[in-house]
């Protein structure tokens, strides 16, 4: 949580400068048009102002810049490079800002960013080098700690003919450049799956959130080199069971726990192991709240309160014995 | 820096009761299991008892020897950890640690207080 | 309950040379896949601390020569080359069953 400040101790520019761009390096004090500046706090806020472009007098002591619910559109290369830089900027919040492209090197010369929020932008064309700005095989490390990209699922109608996941996926493993990286999330993004290379090149993950997306299984998805994982949210998906090779990764993470409400799981035969493994974890919170949603049978029936009778599989017919 | 901090201690009579504190700082409190450990006098290591964090309710486990007499309790908004002592017997006499438990609980404890003696005598 | 067997109950040492405690559980302490048997060190007049977690993971901080290994039932806390600083009482504790118990220590004192 980014710190913020009173609105008394803010100053604000008067609007009759919104079109003024400075052609002389800003002033210390000054505080762009159409935004409320805090030098105390180190924070400016750009908020629900309809802003085309990123201001270009932004003070170089800003350490968090709010730039939420504007119409930015396109995050072009360089869009925070200043002279001299923004060298305090920490933390940065374009959350619902109608962005719809990032371009590679867009968070460019900004050395102590360690907080960027993305969410809420329908982000159809995320550069793979947007956040690693070369598209060297290795590039210089991110000072990027907190990655929020929640909910930047483009609609159907203007996504470009790839993979939403694999954009995503390319922007946060090019040039390893966010090794370092503490907090991820990825919320409400209608991911079906998650590429099997991406957690293992982000080593540091403290922190992954993965709710309220279509993730159907994680058979191919391997946790065993997040050592420093604490948190896993995984509600809201499609997941149907956990199979053993997920169970024993996850039981054995030293700081882990798991959130796995609201999941469609299936209660047939296959989910045996995952109700042997539930009655004895401690590692997923709020475990008495997970009901199966099929078979019919079982919907709502808790997953603790199953025994081995009650997981059945019905036999495959012979093809001799089926009916049309 | 994790800081776990015991008071409450003292000597009381066979059949009193005591409640043992512990101050935790330097961690978000709410997400910890939380224990109680205790050693009598040149003696090894007895489990007493855990809390569950937020996400697993607070609810508690107890050891055998203490079930019905010892109750568990947090004050999340204090961060604070308490062991009432009901019933006490001479076996109690011991010095008591508040630990708490590693992020995947299965791992036990990776932070112990400095510990608080009980003395249960007549 | 577990029960956890610790031999040898003392141990004297040599400055420089190695060491090795055992601690034998009377049911394994594994659970998909991992042993949870840790080992503490409680230095005199001082509270517990954690040196090996999950049978054989040193915890930060702790001197690489401390090793833990072992699986199942059977596990060994090694010493590479013992130092005055180790003396103390050792104690093994497995937390795969509710209650969680304690081997009945090890110490170890120098000759």
């Known amino acids: 949580s980014s710190p913020t400040s009173s609105a008394s101790s803010f100053s604000s520019s008067a609007p009759f400068l919104a079109s003024a761009v400075s052609a002389q390096p800003p002033l210390p004090d000054q505080c762009p048009a159409l935004c409320e500046c805090s030098e105390a706090a180190r924070t400016v806020k750009c908020v629900n102002r309809n802003l085309t472009e990123v201001p270009t007098d932004l003070p170089a002591y800003v350490r968090n810049l709010f730039l939420t619910g504007n119409q930015l559109a396109v995050l072009p290369a360089g869009a925070f490079a200043r002279r001299p830089p923004l060298a305090e900027l920490a933390a940065l919040n374009l959350s619902g800002s109608r962005l719809d492209e990032v371009r590679a090197g867009a968070f460019e010369h900004l050395p102590s960013l360690r907080q960027l929020d993305l969410s809420h932008n329908p982000l159809a064309d995320l550069s793979p080098f947007a956040f690693s700005g070369s598209n060297a095989s290795v590039s210089a490390p991110s000072p990027l700690v907190e990655l929020i990209l929640n909910h930047i699922v483009p609609p159907e109608d203007e996504r470009q003919n790839r993979s939403f996941e694999g954009m995503v996926v390319a922007a946060l493993l090019a040039g390893r450049a966010l090794q370092g990286l503490r907090r991820l999330e990825l919320a409400s993004n209608h991911f079906l799956y998650l590429p099997r290379d991406v957690l293992a090149q982000l080593p540091s993950l403290r922190h992954l959130d993965l709710s309220n997306n279509s993730l159907v299984s994680l058979t191919y998805v391997s946790f065993r080199n997040l050592t420093h994982l604490e948190s896993l949210h995984l509600e809201d998906n499609a997941l149907k069971v956990l199979h053993n090779g997920t169970l024993a990764e996850l039981q054995g993470l030293p700081h882990i726990r798991v959130f796995l409400d609201n999941n469609p799981w299936v209660c047939d035969c296959h989910m045996a192991d995952m109700v042997t493994w539930l009655k004895e974890t401690e590692v997923v919170q709020g475990k008495d709240r997970l009901t199966c949603a099929y078979p019919e049978k079982m919907r709502n029936r808790v997953l603790l309160e199953l025994n081995s009778a009650d997981l059945d599989c019905d036999p495959i017919l012979p093809p001799s014995l089926q009916t049309s | 820096e994790v800081q776990l901090v015991e008071s409450g201690g003292g000597l009381i009579q066979p059949g009193g009761s005591l409640r043992l504190s512990c101050a935790a700082s330097g961690f978000t409190f709410t997400d910890y299991y939380m224990s109680w450990v205790r050693q009598p006098p040149g003696k090894g290591l007895e489990w007493v008892g855990f809390i569950r964090n937020k996400g697993n309710g607070y609810t508690t486990e107890n050891s055998a020897s203490v079930k019905g007499r010892f109750t568990i309790s947090r004050d999340n908004s204090k961060s604070t950890l308490y062991l009432q002592m009901n019933s006490l017997r001479a076996e109690d006499t011991a010095v008591y640690y508040c630990?708490?438990?590693?992020?995947?609980?299965?791992?036990?404890?990776?932070?112990w207080g400095q510990g608080t003696l009980v003395t249960v005598s007549s | 309950d577990i029960v956890l067997t610790q031999s040898p109950l003392s141990l004297p040492v040599t400055p420089g040379e190695p060491a090795s405690i055992s601690c034998r559980a009377s049911e394994s302490v594994e659970f998909y896949g991992t042993s949870f048997l840790q080992w503490y060190l409680q230095k005199p007049g001082q509270s517990p601390q954690l040196l090996i977690y999950g049978a054989s993971n040193v915890e930060s901080g702790v001197p690489d020569r401390f090793s833990g290994s072992g699986s199942g039932t059977d596990f060994t806390l090694k010493i590479s080359r013992v130092e005055a600083e180790d003396i103390g009482v050792y104690f093994c504790?497995?937390?795969?069953?509710?209650?969680?118990?304690f081997g009945g220590g090890t110490k170890v004192e120098i000759k």
């Open positions: 504790q497995q937390s795969r069953k509710v209650p969680s118990t």
């Open positions: 630990a708490r438990y590693r992020g995947n609980p299965h791992y036990a404890m990776d932070y």
